[in-house]
């Protein structure tokens, strides 16, 4: 069952899905000047069984101007992500969550994809929130939202996260994004 709405927006916060439930669809969109190859699927689909899940189909974009140009192919997501997970295992803060059975990892970039990815989430999907640069988290509960089915309708739970105003590093050393600083040190982050 697909979720009807988008996850809730939280002021000064951004969310991601760490992993995608089986049944999730990702539109194969290309950036301006490129189009999906004629034989290409319009979406990728997370499929699998209890032990292994992966994305069916690959998004491929080609120049709108050129005919019969070389296909741009997505690297195999499982292969890319398995290598990534092995390389970074010691630093993975979300290792338990990203290894969930029945879930697919974020597909790696494909050439000339659209700026924004459009996912069609299914019931049971969780997305995780973080405060953006310059804001710090006040937690009342989990900073996540889950798509649930209630009385035949889908809804997203409200994440218990408030991102409070710009912090002065000199005033509050180490307090920027405290919910996710594995090293506990304030880092430098600026926006143009």
């Amino acid at each position: 069952e697909l979720c009807d709405d988008d996850p809730p927006k939280i002021t000064h916060a951004t969310f991601k899905a760490v992993a995608y439930k089986e049944g999730t669809m990702l539109n194969c969109e290309c950036k301006r000047g490129f189009r999906r190859i004629k034989s290409g699927s319009p979406y990728m689909l997370c499929t699998g069984n209890s032990s292994h899940s992966s994305w069916d189909n690959q998004c491929q974009c080609t120049s709108s101007a050129a005919r019969n140009t070389t296909k741009q192919v997505t690297p195999q997501p499982e292969e890319q992500k398995e290598r990534k997970t092995t390389e970074m295992q010691s630093q993975m803060q979300l290792a338990d969550q990203v290894s969930l059975p029945g879930h697919c990892r974020e597909p790696p970039p494909w050439e000339n994809e659209a700026t924004e990815r459009i996912y069609h989430f299914v019931v049971g999907q969780t997305v995780y929130y973080q405060c953006v640069q310059g804001y710090r988290a006040l937690h009342r509960g989990p900073a996540e939202s889950v798509c649930k089915m209630t009385h035949g309708k889908t809804r997203w739970t409200q994440p218990q996260l408030i991102c409070t105003g710009e912090t002065e590093p000199s005033q509050f050393p180490g307090e920027e994004e405290p919910q996710a600083s594995p090293d506990g040190l304030p880092e430098s982050e600026t926006s143009r």
Epitope: P7, K9, A13, T14, F15, K16, K31, Q72, P75, Q80, K84, T85, M88, Q91, M92, Q93, L94, V98, E106, P108, P109, E111, N112, E113, A114, T115, E116, R117, V127, Q130, C131, V132, Q133, E177, Q179, A180, S181, P182, D183, E187, E189, T190, S191, R192
Partner: nanobody
């Protein structure tokens, strides 16, 4: 297949400079945070710096602040790391990496620090001699 190709590493004396480049032909920069990790012998890989393709937000780990500068040329699909006043402790293999932005084209440095990236380069060696 989309790949990240690093260049610009080498051997330099303490106090010297290097400029690393990461070419990502075909990558839609506006949808990603792009930047650098490093791994010194016997140490864990750490996120050094990133820049977001959406609005140019930059991030630096404490130990390089004021010495390293990250920049991007979206037209050339390339990210640069200008490294000045290099120290022996900067010796490491430097890896280019990209990570998908979050909702509304925003990014949180916590994601970079977690090291869970969507794509990695093969790395370039930087050696700073004393």
């Amino acid at each position: 297949q989309l790949q990240l190709v690093e260049s610009g590493g080498g051997l330099v004396q303490a106090g010297g400079s290097l400029r690393l480049s990461c070419a990502a032909s075909g990558l839609t920069f506006e949808g990603y945070a792009i930047g650098w990790f490093r791994q010194a012998p016997g140490k864990e890989r750490e996120g050094v710096s990133y820049i977001t393709g959406s609005d140019g937000t930059t991030y630096y780990i404490n130990s390089v602040k004021g010495r390293f500068t990250i920049s991007s040329d979206n037209a050339k699909s390339t990210v640069y790391l200008q490294m000045n006043t290099l120290k022996p402790e900067d010796t490491a293999v430097y890896y280019c990496a990209v990570d998908r932005l979050g909702s509304q084209g925003r990014y949180a440095s916590a994601w970079w620090r977690s090291g869970d990236m969507d794509l990695w380069g093969k790395g370039t060696q930087v050696t700073v001699s004393s």
